[in-house]
């Protein structure tokens, strides 16, 4: 059920229409139970949850990652630079959530939902931004190249890319989360 | 099974700095979503939140006793810490640690260490 | 800071009776609303958490609902276990803060 389309809403036609940043909350915590229901599939099928062989394999990623000085976290929270780095991070994070689309067997809808919905959420964060022409947009010429060396990794190391990407978006959300809460 | 437990002194005198370990294990403090928090309570009273940091580092604290007050982590060895510098008789209270650890970071507690009483 | 308001500051029933008590938020903090019991002489136990979401092992006696800024606590059948005092706490964004509390006397 995508957000803001739940039984409590209907149930309840008292309540006020979500507000922008209600909005942006209930669809990061809807993207974050599909990163959930992928991360069982990912777990199920393979020991990569345990797997302590991480670092080899994060070597060749470079997913977006909160830093002090992003602007995100509470010494030195700075609005402005925390949005153009949470709505950069998923611009970039998108070319890894084309990756994972046909990583999955039985959820497989579910990581298009999840790849459909963080678009989604890009667009609301854009609106709130002021300062847009402060974020980059990744280069698609690199990011087909990235994904053409991605999908030619052998059985092992896509299955711990898979699980490292799913493990930083989730951390890269939750991150967000708590920053935009403090918006 | 998740516990913590507050370790510290027991009495302080006015003006000294109270240091509190909070002491745990059955999770990780590296776990993305997790977070350690302080809350104290006077005697007959009720809770005030103090202060609290994440896996990532990040901390918060209660704007009314931000000046006086420190926390940190220790992943390897399982520990957070709070400082509260110049102490006075009304700081007399009960401090407990609490873990928070959801997805969606409702920061709920939903496990409390047994509170040490400091006077 | 969102100031959490709770109501009554105590209430008195009897076993298999059934309660219902209040928490505002000043302002409004969707479903980020958490509620507690403590025992006196013992640590708060989470009973709720999300506005309605029941903490594992806490019986379906208990049953939180509320959104936006009006929240309530239901015990129904109440059990000598459930005195003392409950607390709700905002969870929307730091700082926390807590209500007051609601003294419970079976």
């Known amino acids: 059920v995508p957000p803001g389309e739940d039984s409590k809403d209907v149930a309840a036609p008292h309540r006020q229409p979500l507000t922008s940043s209600e909005r942006i909350d209930k669809q990061i915590r809807y993207i974050l139970d599909g990163i959930s229901a992928l991360r069982k599939e990912t777990c199920n099928k393979s020991n990569m949850c345990e797997s302590s062989k991480e670092a080899l394999a994060e070597n060749n990623l470079n997913l977006p990652k909160m830093a002090e000085k992003d602007g995100c976290f509470q010494s030195g929270f700075n609005e402005e630079t925390c949005l153009v780095k949470i709505i950069t991070g998923l611009l970039e994070f998108e070319v890894y959530l084309e990756y994972l689309q046909n990583r999955f067997e039985s959820s497989e809808e579910q990581a298009r939902a999840v790849q459909m919905s963080t678009k989604v959420l890009i667009q609301f964060l854009q609106k709130k931004a002021k300062n847009l022409d402060a974020i980059t947009t990744p280069d698609p010429t690199t990011n087909a190249s990235l994904l053409t060396k991605l999908q030619a990794q052998n059985q092992w190391l896509q299955d711990m890319t898979t699980h490292l990407i799913l493990r930083s978006f989730k951390e890269f959300l939750q991150s967000s989360l708590r920053a935009l809460r403090q918006m | 099974q998740v516990t913590l437990k507050e370790s510290g002194p027991t009495l302080v005198k006015p003006t000294q700095t109270l240091t509190l370990t909070c002491s745990f294990s059955?999770?990780?403090?590296?776990?993305?979503?997790?977070?350690v928090g302080w809350v104290r309570q006077p005697p007959g009273k009720a809770l005030e939140w103090l202060a609290f940091?994440?896996?990532?580092?990040?901390?918060y604290y209660s704007p009314s006793l931000e000046s006086r007050l420190t926390i940190t982590k220790d992943t390897s060895k399982n520990q957070v810490v709070l400082t509260m510098t110049n102490m006075d008789p009304v700081d007399t209270a009960t401090y407990y640690c609490?873990?928070?650890?959801?997805?969606?970071?409702?920061?709920?507690?939903?496990?409390w260490g047994q509170g040490t009483l400091v006077t | 800071d969102i100031q959490m308001t709770q109501s009554p500051s105590s209430l008195s029933a009897f076993v298999g009776d059934g309660v219902t008590m209040t928490c505002w938020a000043s302002?409004?903090?969707?479903?980020?609303l958490n509620w507690y019991h403590q025992r006196p002489g013992e640590a708060p136990e989470l009973l709720v958490f999300?506005?309605?979401n029941l903490q594992i092992g806490v019986p379906s006696r208990f049953r939180g609902s509320g959104s936006e800024t009006y929240f309530t606590l239901t015990i129904n059948s109440l059990q000598p276990e459930d005195s003392g005092t409950y607390f709700c706490?905002?969870?929307?964004?730091?700082?926390?803060?807590f209500g007051g509390g609601t003294k419970l006397e079976i």
């Open positions: 999300a506005a309605s």
């Open positions: 059955g999770f990780s403090l590296s776990t993305s979503g997790v977070g």
């Open positions: 706490q905002h969870g929307h964004s730091f700082p926390l803060t």
């Open positions: 609490a873990r928070s650890a959801d997805d969606y970071l409702y920061y709920s507690f939903d496990t």
């Open positions: 302002q409004s903090i969707n479903d980020y």
């Open positions: 940091i994440w896996w990532d580092d990040d901390k």
